[in-house]
């Protein structure tokens, strides 16, 4: 929802968290602001305090329940409001009718580990975190590998168009240090976006055996 020069963007992690960012040009200084969530069909409501992340933007996480509890469904709409204190009252700065399963951003994949490493290849696995059972297998992944002397931005993206929580990296250089990251996205939702990248997993390929042709 955009009000003049104000932008209010939120994502649902598919379980029990809605993360919001509010940005406003000519922002109000030293003012207390919060996000209030009011679902149309459920009994709970929730508030979080907006904290500055830059000169003109604030962020907060609405914690709806235990991390793995399913607090919203595809039938729900949540009214989200940015409220800022003006003297003794609260002023509505931004508002949106939020459809959680149209605005998904999952948590970054976790528990990355090297399953098997050789001179030229490495098998890596991971797990998804706090992802709704509603998706069943309707997820996709992107992965990237950082090679020596390159940046993450230069790393080619590998796309896994199905729920596959492992990858076999090929054509690697022996005895070389690499880093690996993966991210996940549900296929559902008009405004759904990629999760953050996972924490990088560092690994080293095995050295080529002496006297062997590699």
């Amino acid at each position: 929802a955009v009000n003049g020069t104000s932008q209010f963007t939120c994502f649902y992690n598919s379980r029990a968290n809605i993360s919001c960012v509010w940005s406003q040009d000519g922002a109000l200084q030293d003012t207390s602001c919060q996000v209030h969530a009011w679902p149309d069909r459920r009994r709970w409501n929730q508030t979080c305090e907006l904290l500055p992340v830059s000169q003109a933007s604030w962020a907060c996480n609405l914690i709806l329940g235990a991390p793995d509890s399913q607090k919203l469904t595809t039938v729900d709409i949540v009214t989200l409001r940015v409220l800022c204190r003006e003297g003794v009252r609260w002023r509505v700065m931004a508002i949106q009718d939020f459809k959680p399963f149209e605005n998904l951003r999952l948590m970054a994949p976790i528990s990355l580990q090297v399953v098997h490493v050789e001179t030229h290849r490495c098998n890596i696995s991971w797990e998804i975190s706090q992802a709704s059972h509603y998706f069943e297998r309707h997820l996709e992944f992107e992965a990237r590998t950082l090679s020596p002397g390159h940046t993450w931005e230069e790393a080619p993206l590998l796309t896994l168009k199905q729920k596959q929580e492992w990858i076999c990296l090929e054509t690697l250089t022996p005895d070389t240090q690499y880093e690996f990251q993966v991210r996940v996205k549900p296929l559902q939702g008009e405004f759904t976006t990629w999760s953050p990248w996972s924490q990088p997993l560092a690994f080293r390929t095995k050295p080529a055996a002496l006297g062997k042709d590699t």
Partner: antibody, heavy 116, light 107 residues
């Protein structure tokens, strides 16, 4: 206290339409979904659809799609369920209910009899 | 559509008994399961919402549990006024669906 009061029993001919009303009081009418459920004599409960008075948004059970229309008049805090092309198997009790994490308050029910 | 199956369809118990009614969903509905009581005259009341939440004004002898596909309504000590038909209902997805009901009688 929250109350939902429905209109009285109706007798209709096959092919006709019926419009049942549900007057809400004791809460902010525009802030909660109103759902409609029906029950044939001696049978279970069947969800027909729901409406959000604040926006007029509706959801319908496909079984009744095209025959049922849900509306509201927010000025008098009243929801309506209209069922058209009535058949003998529409002889049931119709209930309205407020939705808030379950159907937390119910109307008393309206018996509609379809008979030639 | 999600099918809801209740068991038993009827039961008879004595005052003071512990009574259990089960409800099974045809697919995972997380905790989006509610229980209702319908008295013989037709009055409907919400007892339990979101699997285990006790609706206001409902006696504490009623409780709910479960997750995913299997759910239970328990009456810890049956009272004469509990004679009714009990329904489970999922509000995980449209169309909302109900179990076929469990008719509870006093021996």
């Amino acid at each position: 206290q929250v109350q939902l009061v429905q209109s009285g029993a109706e007798v209709k001919k096959p092919g006709a339409s019926v419009k049942v009303s549900c007057k809400a009081s004791g809460y902010t009418f525009t802030s909660h979904w109103i759902t409609w459920v029906r029950q044939a004599p001696g049978q279970g409960l069947e969800w027909m659809g729901d409406i959000y008075p604040g926006s007029g948004n509706t959801n319908y059970n496909e079984k009744f799609q095209g025959r049922v229309t849900l509306t509201v008049d927010t000025s008098i805090s009243t929801a309506y369920m209209e069922l058209s092309r009535l058949r003998s198997d529409d002889t049931v009790v119709y209930y309205c209910a407020r939705e808030r994490g379950g159907f937390d308050y119910w109307g008393q029910g309206t018996l509609v009899t379809v008979s030639s | 559509d999600i099918q809801m199956t209740q068991s038993p369809s009827s039961l008879s118990a004595s005052v003071g008994d512990r009574v259990t009614i089960t409800c099974r969903a045809s697919q995972d509905i997380s905790n989006f399961l509610n229980w209702y009581q319908q008295k013989p005259e037709g009055t409907l009341k919400l007892l339990i919402y979101y699997t285990s939440g006790l609706h206001s004004g409902v006696p504490s002898r009623f409780s709910g549990s479960g997750s995913g596909t299997d759910f239970t309504l328990t009456i810890s000590s049956l009272q004469p006024e509990d004679v009714a038909t009990y329904y489970c209902q999922q509000d995980n997805n449209h169309p909302y669906t109900f179990g076929q009901g469990t008719k509870l009688e006093i021996k």
